[in-house]
Amino acid sequence: FKVATPYSLYVCPEGQNVTLTCRLLGPVDKGHDVTFYKTWYRSSRGEVQTCSERRPIRNLTFQDLHLHHGGHQAANTSHDLAQRHGLESASDHHGNFSITMRNLTLLDSGLYCCLVVEIRHHHSEHRVHGAMELQVQTGKDAPSNCVVYPSSSQDSENITAA
């Protein structure tokens, strides 16, 4: 399986909400001994590998923001802890999973990573990640709403987020 990032860049005004999205692609083993662990974290474009370093998002670690379930089941993070920080991560039945960040500030700008771990008990873990950039802007040059830019593999036109 693979992880797709529909958008590689999100440009948002300060105070806006944004939902960063990843999508699980390809065949998903729904066997009894296969489970999926999904999470989000901030990172940097490291020299060795992008998304290797795991930094907190608004003081919440990737352990706090994880989703756990089998296959394409829906799931949510622990609501209380995340929502106190203006965050919520969620997953649906179609392989989409996302993190919503409310009331953006300039400090939220940076590289965000989604991580999916396919756990084949008795065999191994298979991990894949996706990366996307969030730019929070302020002042007269800031857009009125979030503007998202598709990843290079998709259409190059920018799409305004709903």
């Epitope: 352990q63 756990h68 089998g70 756990i119 873990e125």
Partner: antibody
């Protein structure tokens, strides 16, 4: 802050079953791997096995089928049973939280188990 | 199973010196390798994950490097509290395995 605490008898007779429990406090047991690791006196670390929150288990083939790991989410506890013990099973036994695609990030303080008649 | 071989078994150094510890895997573990520190009578503590990333709260004097089969943990300038045993651990597949450890002792 998640904390782990091992409990169980410190002395077990050869051929009997070693039973230990790990109590998880300060966080949920309903996620992650919950693992057992041991360390014979003066030696290195050996991974025994884990139970995943979903109930799936996995253990070190070197221990053959002597290992049983179970979880009681209502008590926030997981347990280890190691059958047919010998003196070679004498060790400090640790419980630990293991994060998928990460590492053992939280450990109990360990409990010494001696196998002797 | 994957065998991890650590060297040297013992490293005798003075505070302020640089420590270089090696871990070699019997087959490639990519960068899925962690390092732990263990002091007498205590549980191990996570230092490094994914070969080169410091865990939360770990001082910058600890650094990891390597990928594939050869890995290094470096302590740039030893502090008195750094004298301990260090273990590497792979997680590319099960069973999870640890190296035999390197003891860093005061010279």
């Amino acid at each position: 802050q998640v904390q782990l605490q091992e409990s169980g008898p410190g002395l077990v007779k050869p051929s009997e079953t070693l039973s230990l429990t790990c109590t998880v406090s300060g966080g949920s047991i309903s996620s992650y791997y919950w693992s057992w690791i041991r360390q014979p006196p003066g030696k290195g670390l050996e991974w025994i096995g884990y139970i995943y929150y979903s109930g799936s288990t996995n253990h070190n083939p070197s221990l053959k089928s002597r290992v049983t790991i179970s979880v009681d989410t209502s008590k926030s506890q997981f347990s280890l049973k190691l059958s047919s013990v010998t003196a070679a099973d004498t060790a400090v036994y640790y419980c630990a939280r293991d994060i998928p695609a990460f590492a053992f990030d939280i450990w109990g303080q360990g409990t010494m188990v001696i196998v002797s008649s | 199973e994957i065998v991890l071989t650590q060297s040297p078994a013992t490293l005798s150094l003075s505070p302020g010196e640089r420590a270089t510890l090696s871990c070699r895997a019997s087959q490639s573990v990519s960068y899925y390798l962690a390092w732990y520190q263990q002091k007498p009578g205590q549980a191990p503590r996570l230092l490094i994950y994914d070969a080169f990333n410091r865990a939360t709260g770990i001082p910058a004097r600890f650094s990891g490097s390597g990928s594939g089969t050869d890995f290094t943990l470096t302590i740039s300038s030893l502090e008195p509290e750094d004298f301990a045993v260090y273990y590497c651990q792979q997680r590319i597949n099960w069973p999870l395995t640890f190296g035999g450890g390197t003891k860093v002792e005061i010279k």
